[in-house]
């Protein structure tokens, strides 16, 4: 276990070999969950890449964020996908945290502390708990299949998951970078498995 | 395995219509957001509409919001492209995609062309 606080991974170039895998103390499925994290890249323009990839033996988007060039963020629960879509594209460090819960298939999604419109997805699904979980790559099998045209370059950090929905106030206050506890993933204690050309540097956000 | 095969494509006058269709199998088609994608004759791949799995929600490019409409039927495991008010520039091949991520062709998709 790794304290990584105020650090980040860094991905300087497009790669399919470049990864962080993260090990998370999940026993049994999912019926929600929520996860926040930060990134930094200049890619948005340019084409998509893949922010989180959760995947199962089963299924390989159980649940994927990504970013989708020309559209904004997909979220993707099961292989079933939704889309935010986001008009301007900047370059600047953003917080996301999106959360799903299967009783209603409700997902919220935030940016920068801002909620989107609420949508639905995947009702009554479970998520499964044997998964591998890689930053900087999407996978298309468990564990690999990578696609450098979907890698990540840039900064991520403060990766940090729940197997329950947050509260708004729970989220606003993490934006704000007051305290929390993450019970599945937990940028604080964080257990990770290193790939390729990935940095640990000091975080470039507040 | 995943197969997604388009048709419908053609040569259509500007101002003109199609109907694109897409038949999709070795998969749960309705438990799958589908997309179109076109490829156009300078090989740029462009993202032009996405629906969800359970038709709830489609979006679509500024390029083709208001002349064409992503519809599905996952009884019959097919997606849809109705296109109209056509332009030279829609001329590409259109792919149907399974998830927004894969954007690269992964089918033969179907050609259409706009001329006068």
């Known amino acids: 276990q790794t304290d990584m606080s105020r650090k980040a991974f860094v991905f300087p170039k497009e790669s399919d070999t470049s990864y962080v895998s993260l090990k998370a103390p999940l026993t049994k499925p999912l019926k929600a969950f929520t996860v926040c994290l930060h990134f930094y890249t200049e890619l948005s323009s340019t084409r998509g890449y893949s922010i989180f990839s959760y995947a199962t033996k089963r299924q390989d988007n159980e649940i994927l964020i990504f970013w989708s060039k020309d559209i904004g963020y997909s979220f993707t629960v099961g292989g079933s996908e939704i889309l935010f879509e986001v008009p301007e594209v900047t370059v600047a460090p953003v917080h996301i945290c999106t959360s799903w819960e299967s009783a209603s298939g409700i997902v919220e999604f935030w940016v920068d502390g801002k909620p989107r419109v609420r949508k639905s997805l995947k009702k009554g699904y479970t998520v499964g708990a044997e998964a591998s979980i890689i930053l900087g790559q999407e996978q298309d099998s468990f564990g690999g299949n990578f696609e450098g045209s979907q890698s990540l370059v840039g900064d991520i950090g403060n990766v940090n998951m729940w197997d329950f929905v947050l509260s708004p106030d729970e989220i606003n206050t993490i934006y704000l970078g007051g305290p929390f506890s993450p019970n599945v993933l937990n940028w604080r204690a964080l257990k990770y498995e290193v790939q390729g050309e990935v940095f640990t540097k000091p975080q470039l956000w507040p | 395995e995943v197969k997604l095969l388009e048709s419908g494509g053609g040569l259509v006058k500007p101002g003109g219509s199609l109907k694109l269709s897409c038949a999709a199998s070795?998969?749960?088609?309705?438990?799958?957001?589908m997309s179109w994608i076109r490829q156009t004759p300078d090989k740029r791949l462009e993202w032009v509409a996405t629906?969800?799995?359970?038709?709830?929600?489609?979006y679509y490019s500024k390029s083709v919001k208001g002349r064409f409409t992503i519809s599905r039927d996952n009884a019959k495991n097919t997606l849809y492209l109705q296109m109209s008010s056509l332009k030279s520039e829609d001329t590409a091949i259109y792919y149907c995609?399974?998830?927004?991520?894969?954007?690269?062709?992964l089918s033969q998709g179907t050609l259409v062309t706009v001329s006068a």
């Open positions: 995609s399974r998830h927004t991520s894969d954007y690269y062709p």
């Open positions: 629906i969800s799995s359970g038709n709830t929600y489609t």
């Open positions: 070795g998969f749960t088609f309705s438990d799958y957001g």
